[in-house]
């Protein structure tokens, strides 16, 4: 396996609707046609896969139907969006990129994006 550099922002703040977006950029050493992107969450000293998608260069990322992730690709950048986040989902979200085809296989792991999620305050009841 050959190593590849993966860059991602250090910190992202989720929106009030629990949506966080960030770019995962990889330094592709060749012309990959098949790429796999995996997002893993690190919290409480444990890593767990959040979502994964394999895509052909030039095509859209396809996550599973029940995935909380969506994304688009542009060249060597993947724009990832994670939805349905709550305060308890705050953590380090790590981008792992694999160039699956053609050989040789390349793998890179980003340093992670710390996503902060703040649950919105409930609206006070209004008397009209």
């Amino acid at each position: 396996c050959k190593a590849m550099h993966v860059a991602q922002p250090a910190v992202v703040l989720a929106s009030s609707r629990g949506i966080a977006s960030f770019v995962c950029e990889y330094a592709s050493p060749g012309k990959a046609t098949e790429v796999r992107v995996t997002v893993l969450r690190q919290a409480d000293s444990q890593v767990t896969e959040v979502c994964a998608a394999t895509y052909m260069m030039g095509n859209e990322l396809t996550f599973l139907d029940d995935s909380i992730c969506t994304g688009t690709s542009s060249g060597n950048q993947v724009n990832l969006t994670i939805q349905g986040l709550r305060a308890m989902d705050t953590g380090l979200y790590i981008c792992k990129v694999e160039l699956m085809y053609p050989p040789p296989y390349y793998l890179g792991i980003g340093n992670g994006t710390q996503i902060y999620v703040i649950d919105p305050e409930p609206c006070p009841d209004s008397d009209f």
């Epitope: 396996c1 590849m4 550099h5 890593v47 896969e49 792992k96 792991i109 340093n111």
Partner: antibody
Framework: EVQLVESGGGLVQPGGSLRLSCAAS?????????WAWIRQAPGKGLEWVSS????????YYADSVKGRFTISRDNSKNTLYLQLNSLRAEDTAVYYC??????????WGQGTLVTVSS | DIQLTQSPSSLSASVGDRVTITCSAS?????VYWYQQKPGKAPKLLIY???SLESGVPSRFSGSGSGTDFTLTISSLQPEDFATYYC?????????FGQGTKVEIK
């Protein structure tokens, strides 16, 4: 070509400490991968022990060693360390360091034997 | 933690035999790797992503499976293939290994 060379193993009494080293060459330990320690007790299978991120900011441990072992690195020496404290007989094993792509361990050292015995 | 169970634990086979080793996960995993280990040596990566052959590994080795059930196949066993084989999952920490399958000479 990536090469990993472990050292620091030896005989230690229960409750004692050791520091294992893993010197990497052919690749910077700060680049694009995690780094792991994996052990193998005599005649037994493989057990993942700990991993550290390329940035050094993130560490993970197996429950069996959490609070007793500490993984670290020295970028200037391109070296990975595992500090073993409060050692028990069941920690007796060959300890390997490996380049870690989240379970994808593509380069391994030759291993260093740690024996915990009175 | 995700548990990996390999079967069989050991097997005896002859040169030229087709050998199949299975790895069953306690929950669905997307990343499975296969390693070969010879006595006194460090493990060697054979298969990544369940079915992709690591560079330099002979084509007689192949991997398949998804979800919870995975298989390593050696199509025609060679003398240098007598060793212990391990599967590993990379879905979540702790990264867990199967208990190993020892392939011995019949």
């Amino acid at each position: 070509e990536v090469q990993l060379v472990e050292s620091g193993g030896g005989l230690v009494q229960p409750g004692g400490s050791l520091r294992l080293s893993c010197a990497a060459s052919g690749y910077s330990i700060t680049s694009g991968y995690y780094w792991a320690w994996i052990r193998q007790a005599p005649g037994k299978g493989l057990e993942w022990v700990s991993s550290i991120s390329g940035s050094g900011s993130t560490t993970y441990y197996a429950d069996s060693v959490k609070g007793r072992f500490t993984i670290s690195r020295d970028n200037s020496k391109n070296t990975l360390y595992l500090q073993l404290n409060s050692l028990r007989a069941e920690d007796t094993a060959v300890y390997y360091c490996a380049r870690d792509g989240f379970g994808y361990f593509d380069y391994w050292g030759q291993g260093t034997l740690v024996t915990v015995s009175s | 933690d995700i548990q990996l169970t390999q079967s069989p634990s050991s097997l005896s086979a002859s040169v030229g035999d087709r050998v199949t080793i299975t790895c069953s996960a306690s929950s669905s995993v997307s990343y499975v790797y296969w390693y070969q280990q010879k006595p006194g040596k460090a493990p060697k990566l054979l298969i990544y992503d369940a079915s992709s052959l690591e560079s330099g590994v002979p084509s007689r080795f192949s991997g398949s499976g998804s979800g919870t059930d995975f298989t390593l196949t050696i199509s025609s066993l060679q003398p240098e293939d007598f060793a212990t084989y391990y599967c590993v999952q990379g879905l979540q920490t702790p990264w867990t290994f199967g208990q190993g399958t020892k392939v011995e000479i019949k």
